[in-house]
C-alpha cells in the first residue's frame, strides 16, 4: 500500500514508466529492517563494489574507424567475487591462483582497506542522499547521452562476474555532464538484494531501494581506465534506482531473460544490442551529483556520481529474477551485493533541481542548508 502520489517535484517520485511510485512513510526502513551495512562500516565489516576493476570487467575499447579516436583500456588487476553481507553461507571464498591482493567479498575478511588502502578514504561511495540538505545548483543542466541506442548487431557480452551481472558496452556511447566533462560509457551492472530485502547501494533518507543500475564511464581526457583511477572526474557513474511497478519493463527484460544462461559464476553470454538509454529514467534533468569513489576495491576516489531523481520501474517478477537467478562464489547465491553507505565527511551533494522543496509527506520543514554558487546556462 502506497500513499497518494507525490507531485512531480518531489524527490524520487515516479518511475520512467510515467507512473509515480512515491516513498510513503511505510516505505522507510524500520529499526529491524536496517541492516548493519547501513552504518559506515568498520574495518571488519567493510564491504564494497564498483564494477570497474578486474580483467574481465574492463573492455578494451578499439578505435571505431573514422568515428572514434584511438583508445586503449589497460586491464586492471583482477577483482574476485563477493560474498553476501548478511548471509553466513555466502562467506565461502575461492582463491584464484596468483591473484593475492585482488580478492575481496561483501561482509567479511579480508577487510577492504587491506585489499586496497583507498577503501579507507574519506570520500567514499555509496552515500545516503538527503534531499533536504542537497545544494540546488542551476548550473547542472540536463545530461546528454549520444549513441546509447544500439543496433542488435554486434552483440554485447553479458557476464556473471561473481559480484554482479555486467554488460560490456561497445565504443561510441558518449555522455556529457557539462563543460570539460565528456565521457564514454564502458559497462553497466546492477546491485540488488534478496527476497523481501532491498539492495540498492545509495539510499535516500535511509530508504534502500530494491535495486540500482550503474553505467560506468571514462573521461575523454583519459585513454585508459588505470590513468583515470583516482583522478578527479576521471570516471563517472550514472546511477538509477529500480523499483517495483505494475508492468514488465521490456528494456530490462532483454537482459533479465538471459540471466539463467549465466547463472554460474564466471559464465557469460552474448545478447543483441539494445537501447541502453531505455534502462535509465526518462528525466535527465533532475538528478543528484557528488564526488565519491568506486564502491568496490580498489575504491578509487574522484568518481563523479550522478544519481537520477526519477526511478525505473520493474515488475515484481523481474526484481525476483534479478535477485534469485545468479550464483556467486562458493555455491552461494549472488545476492545483497551492495556496499554500506559511507560518511559524507563534509561533502555536499548537489541537486540539479530544488530538491529541498519537497511536497512529500516526509518533508516537514523544507530547509536548504547548502547552496551552489555556480551560475546556470
Amino acid at each position: 500500500q502506497r500513499l497518494p502520489r507525490m507531485q512531480e517535484d518531489s524527490p524520487l517520485g515516479g518511475g520512467s514508466s510515467g507512473e509515480d511510485d512515491p516513498l510513503g512513510e511505510e516505505d522507510l526502513p524500520s529499526e529491524e529492517d536496517s541492516p548493519r551495512e547501513e552504518d559506515p562500516p568498520g574495518e571488519e565489516d567493510l564491504p564494497g563494489e564498483e564494477d570497474l576493476p578486474g580483467e574481465e570487467d574492463l573492455p578494451e575499447v578499439k578505435p571505431k574507424s573514422e568515428e572514434e579516436g584511438s583508445l586503449k583500456l589497460e586491464d586492471l588487476p583482477t577483482v574476485e567475487a563477493p560474498g553476501d553481507p548478511q548471509e553466513p553461507q555466502n562467506n565461502a571464498h575461492r582463491d584464484k591462483e596468483g591473484d593475492d591482493q585482488s580478492h575481496w567479498r561483501y561482509g567479511g575478511d579480508p577487510p577492504w582497506p587491506r585489499v586496497s588502502p583507498a577503501c579507507a578514504g574519506r570520500f567514499q561511495s555509496p552515500v545516503d542522499i538527503r534531499p533536504q540538505l542537497a545544494a540546488f545548483c542551476p548550473a547542472l543542466r540536463p545530461l546528454e547521452l549520444l549513441g546509447f541506442q544500439l543496433p542488435p548487431l554486434p552483440e554485447l557480452r553479458l557476464r556473471n562476474n561473481g559480484h554482479s551481472v555486467q554488460l560490456t558496452l561497445p565504443p561510441g556511447l558518449e555522455m556529457a555532464l557539462g563543460p570539460g566533462r565528456e565521457y564514454r560509457a564502458l559497462q553497466l551492472h546492477l546491485h540488488w538484494g534478496a527476497a523481501g530485502r532491498p539492495g540498492s547501494e545509495h539510499t535516500v533518507e535511509g530508504h534502500r531501494f530494491p535495486a540500482e543500475i550503474h553505467v560506468v564511464h571514462l573521461s575523454t581526457a583519459f585513454a585508459r581506465v588505470d590513468e583515470a583511477l583516482g583522478r578527479p572526474g576521471g570516471l563517472a557513474v550514472l546511477a538509477a534506482f529500480l523499483e517495483e511497478g505494475p508492468e514488465e519493463n521490456s528494456a530490462y527484460e532483454q537482459l533479465l531473460s538471459r540471466l539463467e544462461e549465466i547463472a554460474e559464476e564466471g559464465s557469460e553470454t552474448q545478447v543483441p544490442g539494445l537501447d541502453i538509454s531505455a534502462l535509465l529514467p526518462s528525466d535527465f534533468s533532475r538528478y543528484f551529483q557528488y564526488e565519491g569513489s568506486l564502491t568496490t576495491p580498489p575504491c578509487a576516489q574522484g568518481v563523479i556520481w550522478t544519481v537520477f531523481n526519477q526511478t525505473v520501474m520493474l515488475s515484481a517478477k523481474q526484481l525476483h529474477t534479478l535477485s534469485d537467478t545468479l550464483w556467486g562464489p562458493g555455491d552461494s547465491r549472488l545476492q545483497l551485493n551492495f556496499r554500506a553507505t559511507q560518511p559524507l565527511n563534509g561533502r555536499v551533494i548537489e541537486a540539479s533541481f530544488p530538491a529541498g522543496v519537497d511536497s512529500s509527506p516526509r518533508a516537514a520543514e523544507p530547509v536548504q542548508l547548502n547552496s551552489c554558487l555556480a551560475a546556470g546556462d
Partner: antibody, heavy 119, light 107 residues
Framework: DVKLVESGGGLVKLGGSLKLSCAAS????????MSWVRQTPEKRLELVAA????????YYLDTVKGRFTISRDNAKNTLYLQMSSLKSEDTALFYC????????????WGQGTSVTVSS | DIQMTQSPSSLSASVGDRVTITCKAS??????VAWYQQKPGQAPRRLIY???NRYTGVPDRFSGSGSGTDFTLTISSLQAEDLADYYC?????????FGGGTKVEIK
C-alpha cells in the same frame, strides 16, 4: 559575442574538390565540439560532419564518408571541411555550428557558405 | 537512422494565436531533441535544447515538451516576428537528424 564565419564555397564541377573554412571568435574555440550542417535547396537540414574539441573524434554522414574530411586548428580558431569527389547532391548551403559547452546540442550557427556542384 | 517526422509542414495563424508544432521520432531519443527557428535569409537560431529547456534570451512564449518519441514546440502567443521555418532535431544517435521543417505564416 560568438561569431562563426564560413568561407570557401563556390561553383565547382562534378567530381571536383573544395575546402570550406569556418573562422570562430568570441569564445574559447578549443573547448567546443563543432559541426558542419548543410541545407539542401529543398531546405532539408543534414548533419554532414562533427568533431570533438581536440579533434580526436570525428563523425561523418554515410553519404560523405571517404569524400569529406572535417578537421580543426585550435591555434587558429578555425574549423575546416575538405570536400572531394563532389556530387550534384552535395549542392547546398553549408553551415558551421558550435555545440553547447560540454554537450552535444548545437547552440550557434554561422551564416553559411554556398556550394554548387555543376556538371 | 532515426527519422524525425515534423507536422504540420506549414501553418497560418493570427497574431496572439497559440501555435503547436509536433515532431515524432522513429525510435526513443529520450530528451535529446532541439528546436531551431530559421527566419528568411538567415541561419537557424537556437530555441530549445533537451526537449524542454529554453536557451537564454529566447522569449518565454516558446516552450518545448515531450520525451521518448513525441515532442512539441509551442508558441503561446504568436507574434509577427515569429514568421519563420521551425526545425526539430535529435542528437541522441548518429546520424543526427532533423525534421522536415514547419513554415509558420502570419494571417
Amino acid at each position: 559575442d560568438v561569431k562563426l564565419v564560413e568561407s570557401g564555397g563556390g561553383l565547382v564541377k562534378l567530381g571536383g574538390s573544395l575546402k570550406l573554412s569556418c573562422a570562430a571568435s568570441g569564445f574559447t574555440f578549443s573547448n567546443y565540439y563543432m559541426s558542419w550542417v548543410r541545407q539542401t535547396p529543398e531546405k532539408r537540414l543534414e548533419l554532414v560532419a562533427a568533431i570533438n574539441s581536440d579533434g580526436g573524434i570525428t563523425y561523418y554522414l554515410d553519404t560523405v564518408k571517404g569524400r569529406f574530411t572535417i578537421s580543426r586548428d585550435n591555434a587558429k580558431n578555425t574549423l575546416y571541411l575538405q570536400m572531394s569527389s563532389l556530387k550534384s547532391e552535395d549542392t547546398a548551403l553549408f553551415y558551421c555550428a558550435r555545440h553547447r559547452s560540454g554537450y552535444f546540442s548545437m547552440d550557434y550557427w554561422g551564416q553559411g557558405t554556398s556550394v554548387t556542384v555543376s556538371s | 537512422d532515426i527519422q524525425m517526422t515534423q507536422s504540420p509542414s506549414s501553418l497560418s495563424a493570427s497574431v496572439g494565436d497559440r501555435v503547436t508544432i509536433t515532431c515524432k521520432a522513429s525510435q526513443n531519443v529520450v530528451s535529446a531533441v532541439a528546436w531551431y527557428q530559421q527566419k528568411p535569409g538567415q541561419a537557424p537560431r537556437r530555441l530549445i535544447y533537451s526537449a524542454s529547456n529554453r536557451y537564454t534570451g529566447v522569449p518565454d512564449r516558446f516552450s518545448g515538451s515531450g520525451s521518448g518519441t513525441d515532442f512539441t514546440l509551442t508558441i503561446s502567443s504568436l507574434q509577427a516576428e515569429d514568421l519563420a521555418d521551425y526545425y526539430c532535431q535529435q542528437y541522441s544517435n548518429y546520424p543526427w537528424t532533423f525534421g522536415g521543417g514547419t513554415k509558420v505564416e502570419i494571417k
